[in-house]
């Protein structure tokens, strides 16, 4: 079936927004007023994956850009990156595993677990203006909880 997508922004549990930091990196920082226009708008696509009653597989692209969040090994460590794709072929229902995240909703907060690397999550630091990364711990210092705001 044609892939179903929605546009949204994400904020971490500390209400930090996500913005571009160079061509292939996201960072998280507090934004207010007109600065909120800097935040990235995601195209969240509902894709095939190891779906369960608690986890919904999604791909996270950047709206109007041919960039997708993906999870790869770098120096033997699961790493989050922005990967450029052919816009003629993406998004698609059957995304490669590195592009897929399990969207988990707990108490009105969202977590995004890497399908490629189970128990690794899209994470932000407590500190301001630090890169968004793939973290291997929940409930620690790093933030793995997000809220989603729909964008028309």
């Amino acid at each position: 079936a044609p892939v179903r997508s929605l546009h949204c922004t994400l904020r971490d549990a500390q209400l930090k927004s996500l913005v571009m930091s160079g061509p292939y990196e996201l960072k998280a920082l507090h934004l207010q007023g007109q600065d909120l226009e800097q935040q990235v708008v995601f195209s969240m696509s509902f894709v095939q994956g190891e779906e369960s009653n608690d986890k919904i597989p999604v791909a996270l692209g950047l709206k109007a850009k041919n960039l997708y969040l993906s999870c790869v090994l770098k120096d033997d460590k699961p790493t989050l990156q922005l990967e450029s794709v052919d816009p003629k072929n993406y998004p698609k229902k059957k995304m490669e595993k590195r592009f897929v995240f399990n969207k988990i909703e707990i108490n009105n907060k969202l977590e995004f677990e890497s399908a490629q690397f189970p128990n690794w999550y899209i994470s932000t630091s407590q500190a301001e203006s630090m890169p968004v990364f793939l973290g291997g711990t929940r409930g620690g210092q790093d933030i793995t909880d997000f809220t989603m705001q729909f964008v028309s």
């Epitope: 079936a1 044609p2 095939q48 190891e50 779906e51 369960s52 986890k55 059957k94």
Partner: antibody
Framework: EVQLQESGPGLVKPSETLSLTCTVS????????VSWIRQPPGKGLEWIGL???????YYNSPLKSRLTISKDNSKSQVSLKLSSVTAADTAVYYC????????????????WGQGTLVTVSS | DIQMTQSPSSLSASVGDRVTITCQTS??????LNWYQQKPGKAPKLLIS???TLWPGVPSRFSGSGSGTDFTFTISSLQPEDFATYYC?????????FGQGTKLEIK
């Protein structure tokens, strides 16, 4: 060679819990998902639910409140428990291996067990 | 849930006949459809995956075609061992759903 074998009691009393085991060989339960499917006598096939390699489960909505699927990777066994059974749960129960071919055929099933008939009756 | 409409529900044919079974889905499923053969007292066997891909070891007289919402399963020349019940299964999204089955009988 991939093989799946269902086992369990052939007769269960109404309101009790139906418990079945699927023992597999030729593949690893940590890598491949397993589905359960049932077929009432003389009727068609109904997909019940599955357990993925990582342990996550998806249960078909009509059975969700009564269904538990779990597994023991080291014993190569998947279990199905269906509580509060009625005569409507009388069926041949099959387990089947998921293909798990990412970006090709993740949800398809290739190899099936031979099935086991469970009758719900007092 | 995706609804499956398989037809006919039963079919009488002779050895050597060409037989066609159709499966319609309530929404677009690309090519995410499998076809299975089931003989009495036996488990279903996978014949065709992804709409048209012949499963290894399955004779070439079996074929599948279609995409989107309309799918066709064909046996080009019926053999005695082909008399069985055939089911389609959509593997596009959960819950997985089967067609009602087509019982192929000897005329």
């Amino acid at each position: 060679e991939v093989q799946l074998q269902e086992s369990g009691p052939g007769l269960v009393k109404p309101s009790e819990t139906l418990s079945l085991t699927c023992t597999v060989s030729g593949f690893s339960l940590s890598e491949f998902g397993v589905s359960w499917i049932r077929q009432p006598p003389g009727k068609g096939l109904e997909w019940i639910g599955l357990i993925w390699g990582g342990g996550d489960t998806y249960y078909n909505s009509p059975l969700k409140s009564r269904l538990t699927i779990s597994k023991d990777n080291s014993k190569s066994q998947v279990s199905l428990k269906l509580s509060s059974v009625t005569a409507a749960d009388t069926a041949v129960y099959y387990c089947a291996k998921q293909r798990n071919l990412w970006a090709y055929d993740l949800y398809g099933m290739d190899y099936w067990g031979q099935g086991t008939l469970v009758t719900v009756s007092s | 849930d995706i609804q499956m409409t398989q037809s006919p529900s039963s079919l009488s044919a002779s050895v050597g006949d060409r037989v066609t079974i159709t499966c319609q889905t309530s929404q677009d499923i690309d090519m995410d459809l499998n076809w299975y053969q089931q003989k009495p007292g036996k488990a279903p066997k996978l014949l065709i995956s992804q709409g048209s891909t012949l499963w290894p070891g399955v004779p070439s007289r079996f074929s599948g075609s279609g995409s989107g919402t309309d799918f066709t399963f064909t046996i080009s020349s019926l053999q005695p061992e082909d008399f069985a019940t055939y089911y389609c299964l959509q593997t596009d999204s959960f819950p997985l759903t089967f067609g009602q089955g087509t019982k192929l009988e000897i005329k």
